[in-house]
Interface confidence: medium
């Protein structure tokens, strides 16, 4: 399997979005690639969401999707946007070399994020 | 079930142009990449062209490059290939196949093939 | 003039065993590539015989096998049958044509 390297640990700023680098060290010469984030919490795997990008070029994800990201040769830059407190969890960075064969495919082992609901401002009179 | 059906091939004259069809149904059509491959009577299979499920990478032997370009139209599970500058040495049996993906990828799936004649 | 090469023929009595042989390069079979061979009979579309080198999809009996070394592979063919009679082509990814190349083809005959 491919390998695939992600922080540990990252922590989502007071607007409730989370960056981190999900990097693979690629075995073939990959035209095709593509990203999925994962989380993970209470045993359960949801996707968050997905993007397919040509080398080279920027990742589209779809329209409604909270993740947006850049490439650059075998780093992709994630961003999740619009996270809370409940969101808080593990979430693995998934890559699949789709084209030319052979097709690889490897998984993180997850980035922890954290995050915490900003406090209420209080009122001021 | 895998179904692949070609169609568009014929008789046509040298330097003329055809269009060959694939329409694709059984399994989500965007996700696979698709080929085509043809047969010369008589002689082995040649591999044409490739695309991948995206539409975004296309591959195709230096004996076609310039001359036939390889599409697919996922909303319609549709795969195309544009035969332009048709040679004698085109004509074969034209097979549509689908790669399948798992660990590596191999040509899993055909048609059965439409026949193009180059030849005046 | 076909990027892997096997022999244009081959041939056996029933019940014998026959092995077809597919010879590639370091850009296709010994870049790593799977192999993967193909039956095809009189008038039909080839038929996916063997994939990655040795696994047998549904359907297709245990009397075919694959095995692949370094820049060769080759097909066995135990038991033989007279339905076995068709044409088989090796088949690999190649790294340097950025496409699939394929073998000739053997002609397979049972005789008898």
């Known amino acids: 399997a491919m390998h695939v390297a992600q922080p540990a640990v990252v922590l989502a700023n007071s607007r409730g979005t989370a960056s981190f680098v999900c990097e693979y060290a690629s075995p073939g010469k990959a035209t095709e690639v593509r990203v999925t984030v994962l989380r993970q919490a209470d045993s359960q795997v949801t996707e968050v969401c997905a993007a397919t990008y040509m080398m080279g070029n920027e990742l589209t994800f779809l329209d409604d999707s909270i993740c947006t990201g850049t490439s650059s040769g075998n780093q992709v830059n994630l961003t999740i946007q619009g996270l809370r407190a409940m969101d808080t969890g593990l979430y693995i960075c998934k890559v699949e070399l789709m084209y030319p064969p052979p097709y690889y495919m490897g998984i993180g082992n997850g980035t922890q994020i954290y995050v915490i609901d900003p406090e209420p401002c209080p009122d001021s009179d | 079930e895998v179904q692949l059906l070609e169609s568009g091939g014929g008789l046509v004259q040298p330097g003329g142009s055809l269009r060959l069809s694939c329409a694709a149904s059984g399994f989500t059509f965007s996700s696979y990449s698709m080929n085509w491959v043809r047969q010369a009577p008589g002689k082995g299979l040649e591999w044409v062209s490739a695309?991948?499920?995206?539409?975004?990478?296309?591959y195709y032997a230096d004996s076609v490059k310039g001359r036939f370009t390889i599409s697919r139209d996922n909303s319609k599970n549709t795969l195309y290939l544009q035969m332009n500058s048709l040679r004698a040495e085109d004509t074969a049996v034209y097979y549509c196949?689908?790669?399948?993906?798992?660990?590596?990828?191999?040509?899993?799936?055909w048609g059965q093939g439409t026949l193009v004649t180059v030849s005046s | 003039q076909s990027v892997l090469t096997q022999p244009p023929s081959a041939s056996g009595t029933p019940g014998q065993r026959v092995t077809i042989s597919c010879t590639g390069s370091?850009?296709?079979?010994?870049?790593?590539?799977?192999v993967h061979w193909y039956q095809q009979l009189p008038g039909t579309a080839p038929k996916l015989l063997i994939y990655r080198n040795n696994q047998r999809p549904s359907g297709v009996p245990d009397r075919f096998s694959g095995s692949k070394s370094g820049t060769s592979a080759s097909l066995a063919i135990s038991g033989l049958r007279s339905e076995d009679e068709a044409d088989y082509y090796c088949?690999?990814?190649?790294?340097?044509?950025?496409?699939?190349?394929f073998g000739g083809g053997t002609k397979l005959t049972v005789l008898g």
């Open positions: 370091s850009s296709n079979i010994g870049a790593g590539y799977d």
């Open positions: 196949a689908r790669d399948r993906v798992e660990m590596n990828q191999w040509l899993a799936d």
């Open positions: 088949a690999a990814w190649d790294d340097s044509l950025n496409g699939w190349v």
């Open positions: 695309i991948s499920g995206s539409g975004g990478s296309t």
